[in-house]
C-alpha cells in the first residue's frame, strides 16, 4: 500500500490507476476507515450522504473535500480499462495536524542551585497524532532522569476535535557554580515524519547560589554531658545565622514536645533523661539544619564522667527549654 499523509481539514485526491479518463468507467472504491464498519464500497454514480465526505470524480479519482481523523484507514480502487485489464490501487491514509507554536507557562524567574526547582511547563495544543515535547538547555537536549533533570508529562485529547494537548513540566537541580543564566527552550516534534520541530521562545532564569550555612553548634553544660542524679544539664544551640532561626530539640531521634528555644534545660536529672540530644535550626530561607548529637549520661557518686560529650548521629531530646 502507498502511504499518504494529509493535513486535517485539507482536500485529498486519490488516483484510481488504470481507470479510463472519463466515463463510462468500470471501477469501484472500497474504504475501511474510522467512518466505516468493515468495508464501504463507493461507485462513480455516487449520490447519498457519503458525497459530503468522499465522492468519485469523473476521472475516477476519489475526492475528500476536508479530511478528518475518521478518514484514516485503507482506500482501494479496482478499475478495468477498455481492454478488460484490471488494475488495483491501494492507499494507506494517515492524517495530521500541526499544533500552534508551543509555549512555556508558569516559568520560574529564579532557580536555586543545589536543590530541585520547577523551571516551567511547556504546552502544545492541537496536534494530531500526539507528537512529543522535549526540553533543551543552551540548545542541547535535556535527558530526563539524568543529572538532576526530571520531566512530568501529561497528554489530553479534546473530546470533540480529537486533537491532542501535551504538557511537560521540567524540574532541574542546577549545579553549584554553574551557568548563572541558563537558557531553556522546549520543542514539539510531530508524530508523523517529514515535519520540522516547533520550538518555544527561550527562557533565561537566574540561578541563585545559597550561601553555605555555618554549622549549628551544640554546647553542653556540664561539659561532657555527664551529671550526677538530681543535677541540671543545660544544652545551648548556637546558630550564627541572622535572623535567628527557630530551634527545636530532639532526643534519640524523636522531636521533644517543647516550644522553640535555643536553650534546653534538664533540671533534676534522672535515668529517663539519658540519651542522645541534638537541636534542629529551621531558617525561613533554608531547610532544617541539625547539630551534632551529644550524649547525656548519669554518673553515680564516685564515678568519673567523660571529658567530652560523645558524638552520635541525629538525636532529639526530652529536655526543658529555657
Amino acid at each position: 500500500a502507498q502511504n499518504i499523509t494529509a493535513r486535517i481539514g485539507e482536500p485529498l485526491v486519490l488516483k484510481c490507476k488504470g481507470a479510463p479518463k472519463k466515463p463510462p468507467q468500470r471501477l469501484e472504491w472500497k474504504l475501511n476507515t474510522g467512518r466505516t464498519e468493515a468495508w464501504k464500497v463507493l461507485s462513480p454514480q455516487g449520490g447519498g450522504p457519503w458525497d459530503s465526505v468522499a465522492r468519485v470524480l469523473p476521472n475516477g479519482s476519489l475526492f475528500l473535500p476536508a479530511v478528518g481523523i475518521q478518514d484514516e484507514g485503507i482506500f482501494r480502487c479496482q478499475a478495468m480499462n477498455r481492454n478488460g485489464k484490471e488494475t488495483k490501487s491501494n492507499y494507506r491514509v494517515r492524517v495530521y495536524q500541526i499544533p500552534g507554536k508551543p509555549e512555556i507557562v508558569d516559568s520560574a524567574s529564579e532557580l536555586t542551585a543545589g536543590v530541585p526547582n520547577k523551571v516551567g511547563t511547556c504546552v502544545s495544543e492541537g496536534s494530531y497524532p500526539a507528537g512529543t515535547l522535549s526540553w533543551h538547555l543552551d540548545g542541547k537536549p535535556l535527558v530526563p532522569n539524568e543529572k538532576g533533570v526530571s520531566v512530568k508529562e501529561q497528554t489530553r485529547r479534546h473530546p470533540e476535535t480529537g486533537l491532542f494537548t501535551l504538557q511537560s513540566e521540567l524540574m532541574v537541580t542546577p549545579a553549584r557554580g554553574g551557568d548563572p543564566r541558563p537558557t531553556f527552550s522546549c520543542s514539539f516534534s510531530p508524530g508523523l515524519p517529514r515535519h520540522r520541530a516547533l520550538r518555544t521562545a527561550p527562557i533565561q532564569p537566574r540561578v541563585w547560589e545559597p550561601v553555605p550555612l555555618e554549622e549549628v553548634q551544640l554546647v553542653v553544660e556540664p561539659e561532657g554531658g555527664a551529671v550526677a542524679p538530681g543535677g541540671t544539664v543545660t544544652l545551648t544551640c548556637e546558630v550564627p545565622a541572622q535572623p535567628s532561626p527557630q530551634i527545636h530539640w530532639m532526643k534519640d531521634g524523636v522531636p521533644l514536645p517543647l516550644p522553640p528555644s535555643p536553650v534546653l534545660i534538664l533540671p533534676e536529672i534522672g535515668p529517663q533523661d539519658q540519651g542522645t540530644y541534638s537541636c534542629v535550626a529551621t531558617h525561613s530561607s533554608h531547610g532544617p539544619q541539625e547539630s551534632r548529637a551529644v550524649s547525656i549520661s548519669i554518673i553515680e557518686p564516685g564515678e568519673e564522667g567523660p571529658t567530652a560529650g560523645s558524638v552520635g548521629g541525629s538525636g532529639l531530646g526530652t529536655l526543658a527549654l529555657a
Partner: antibody
Framework: QVQLQQSGAELVRPGTSVKVSCKAS????????IDWVNQRPGQGLEWIGV????????NYNEKFTGKATLTADKSSSTAYMQLSSLTSDDSAVYFC??????????WGQGTSVTVSS | QAVVTQESALTTSPGETVTLTCRSS?????????ANWVQEKPDHLFTGLIG???NRAPGVPARFSGSLIGDKAALTITGAQTEDEAIYFC?????????FGGGTKLTVL
C-alpha cells in the same frame, strides 16, 4: 515545696479581655515550662498552649491562636495568659501546669472565668 | 484533630490492680506521643502522675506506673487504695500540640 498559685475568679463582659496569672514558687521558674489548659463546664480538658519562661518561646493549640496570649515575667516568677474578644464559649476553669520536658507534674488550683452580659 | 479515647468508668477494690487505657484515633500510641496521666480529685485538684509514657512525677507513689500495652498507653495502679478514687485523664502529644482524653472515673469500693 512546688506551688502554682493562680489569680481569683473573674466575671467579665462579652467582647472584653481577661488576664489570668500563675505565680510559681518552690523551684527555678526558668528551668521548667508552663502549660495552660481549660475545662469547660461538664467537659474534659483542652490544651491551650505552652510557654518557656526562660526564652519566652511559645507554642499554641491552633484553636487558641489569636484568642490566648502567653507571657512570663522572670523577675516575679509569674506566667500570664490573656484571653481576648471573650464570648460565652470562653467560660471555663483555666489551669496552669508546670512541665519538665515531657511531664506535666504540678498544677495550679484553677481560675474560673465566666463571660456574661 | 486527633481524638483520644479512654474508658468512661472503671470500678476496682482496695488492694486490686487496675489498668486504665488511652487510645489514639490516628493509630498506635508510641513513645513519641509522650503519654501523660493526670489525676483530678474534687474541687479541681489536679496532680500529674506520669509523663513521657512511663516517667513518674516527683512524689507520686510507686503503685502508679505508665506503659504501652498493644497500641494504647496505659496507667496501672498496683494495689489500689481508697484515696485513688478520682478521674484520670491521659494526654498525648501530636507533633505540636497536646490532646486530652475524656477521662476515666475510677471508683474504689
Amino acid at each position: 515545696q512546688v506551688q502554682l498559685q493562680q489569680s481569683g475568679a473573674e466575671l467579665v463582659r462579652p467582647g472584653t479581655s481577661v488576664k489570668v496569672s500563675c505565680k510559681a514558687s518552690g523551684y527555678a521558674f526558668t528551668n521548667y515550662l508552663i502549660d495552660w489548659v481549660n475545662q469547660r463546664p461538664g467537659q474534659g480538658l483542652e490544651w491551650i498552649g505552652v510557654i518557656n519562661p526562660g526564652s519566652g518561646g511559645t507554642n499554641y493549640n491552633e484553636k487558641f491562636t489569636g484568642k490566648a496570649t502567653l507571657t512570663a515575667d522572670k523577675s516575679s516568677s509569674t506566667a500570664y495568659m490573656q484571653l481576648s474578644s471573650l464570648t460565652s464559649d470562653d467560660s471555663a476553669v483555666y489551669f496552669c501546669a508546670r512541665r519538665r520536658v515531657d511531664t506535666m507534674d504540678y498544677w495550679g488550683q484553677g481560675t474560673s472565668v465566666t463571660v456574661s452580659s | 484533630q486527633a481524638v483520644v479515647t479512654q474508658e468512661s468508668a472503671l470500678t476496682t477494690s482496695p488492694g486490686e490492680t487496675v489498668t486504665l487505657t488511652c487510645r489514639s484515633s490516628t493509630g498506635a500510641v508510641t513513645t513519641s506521643n509522650y503519654a501523660n496521666w493526670v489525676q483530678e480529685k474534687p474541687d479541681h485538684l489536679f496532680t500529674g502522675l506520669i509523663g513521657g509514657t512511663n516517667n513518674r512525677a516527683p512524689g507520686v507513689p510507686a503503685r502508679f506506673s505508665g506503659s504501652l500495652i498493644g497500641d494504647k498507653a496505659a496507667l496501672t495502679i498496683t494495689g489500689a487504695q481508697t484515696e485513688d478514687e478520682a478521674i484520670y485523664f491521659c494526654a498525648l502529644w501530636y507533633s505540636n500540640h497536646w490532646v486530652f482524653g475524656g477521662g476515666t472515673k475510677l471508683t474504689v469500693l
